[in-house]
Interface confidence: low
């Protein structure tokens, strides 16, 4: 017996209760490929999630994070609270980076300053909570009148944040 389900296009499911007739996916469900025997429930963008793209009969909803949060994981499976540059997110909220570490983004953890001496170089610009140190030439290379580099302008990461 030929499997008639293979003829059912995306946006439908093969309804065994109706002699393998292709039935449209019910509201709030979708099938992104043909030949499906069921439709998948649409993702709900609730709480810290905001709808980026509505669910259709052939594709799942896509979520963003509300202002003050950023996406984590494949297809924005999680929203993590933003912190300021110079901070990291802990279980108790945003905390300033400890001395000797920095974070130049609104996400992620504080990372140690670069150890210039490991590469035989000297510290040209001191690090801060928001910025890594800038390594310069080795102490032996430094001569009077040598010009010093200026630190880069602060990076900005407001992220997608519709108000």
């Amino acid at each position: 017996l030929q499997d008639l389900c293979s003829n059912c296009p995306a946006g439908t499911f093969c309804d065994n209760n109706r002699s393998q007739i292709c039935s449209p996916c019910p509201p709030n469900s979708f099938s992104s490929a043909g030949g499906q025997r069921t439709c998948d429930i649409c993702r709900q963008c609730k709480g810290v999630f905001k709808t980026r793209k509505e669910c259709s009969s052939t594709s799942n909803a896509e979520c963003d994070c509300i202002s003050g949060y950023h996406c984590l994981g494949a297809e924005c499976s999680m929203c993590e609270q933003d912190c300021k540059q110079g901070q990291e997110l802990t279980k108790k909220g945003c905390k300033d980076c400890c001395f000797g570490t920095f974070n130049d983004q609104k996400r992620g953890i504080c990372r140690p300053w670069t150890n210039c001496s490991l590469d035989g170089k000297s510290v040209l610009v001191n690090g801060t909570k928001e910025r890594d140190v800038v390594c310069g030439p080795s102490p032996a290379d430094l001569s009077p009148g040598a010009s010093s580099a200026t630190p880069p302008a602060p990076a900005r990461e407001p992220g997608h944040s519709p108000q």
Epitope: Q105, E157, H160, P162
Partner: antibody, heavy 121, light 111 residues
């Protein structure tokens, strides 16, 4: 299919302003971010900013915050970019471009043909 | 802002040969799941066209002679074998954070 229609050109006097349009069709206008990109003659691409039509939320590159204002008219599925205090540095092709979605970060999939803005007395 | 440095600025290639374009980001644009780096082709008088998304995913309709690789800060666009119609300027672009930025472009010319 997705289409983004832009006027071919605009001639503006120095110190003046211009409102560029981008009419979208072939998709649900409110569901996708719309971005604007600048390209001076023979130069590279510069991202200006973007707008989410559903909420009117915007993001701008720092250097364009006082130059460009992004708006939308959802009833006509049209995105606009208003450029003010124009100088010769603003003479360029301006593209509107629609984003796709994946995990909160997006690529620029569909592009308009661009509007050539000429600032000249 | 994340700075994208493309090299070379100009790339002469013979027909049928391999073209390799590099794009280096001033910070990582990758997670364990994805690299938020994309490649575009632009021909004179035309808007850019998306070729590769998320470092290595070929956009629909783009010939298989285009491929992308890389993660973290270093990314590569390869074209092999190069054809006449590939004469264009190629740009990398990140979507890791706002503002998005583009590389300076690489002009591919057929020798």
């Amino acid at each position: 299919q997705v289409q983004l229609q832009q006027p071919e050109s605009e001639l503006v006097r120095p110190g003046g302003s211009v409102k560029l349009s981008c009419k979208a069709s072939g998709y649900t206008f409110t569901s996708y971010w719309m971005d604007w990109v600048k390209q001076r003659h023979g130069q590279g691409l510069e991202w200006i900013g973007n707008i989410y039509p559903d909420s009117g939320g915007t993001n701008y590159a720092e250097k364009f915050k006082s130059k460009a204002t992004l708006t939308v008219d959802t009833s006509s599925s049209t995105a606009y970019m208003h450029l003010s205090s124009l100088t010769s540095e603003d003479s360029a092709v301006y593209y509107c471009t629609r984003e796709e979605a994946l995990g909160g970060y997006y690529e620029l999939t569909y592009w308009g043909q661009g509007t050539l803005v000429t600032v000249s007395a | 802002d994340i700075v994208l440095t493309q090299s070379p600025a100009s790339l002469p290639v013979s027909l049928g040969q391999r073209a390799t374009i590099s794009c280096r980001a001033s910070q990582s644009v990758s997670t364990s799941s994805y690299s938020y780096m994309h490649w575009y082709q632009q021909k004179p008088g035309q808007p850019p066209k998306l070729l590769i998304k998320y470092a290595s995913n070929l956009e629909s309709g783009v010939p298989a002679r285009f491929s992308g690789s890389g993660s973290g800060t270093d990314f590569t666009l390869n074209i092999h074998p190069v054809e006449e119609e590939d004469t264009a300027t190629y740009y990398c672009q990140h979507s890791w954070e706002i503002p998005y930025t583009f590389g300076g472009g690489t002009k591919l010319e057929i020798e």
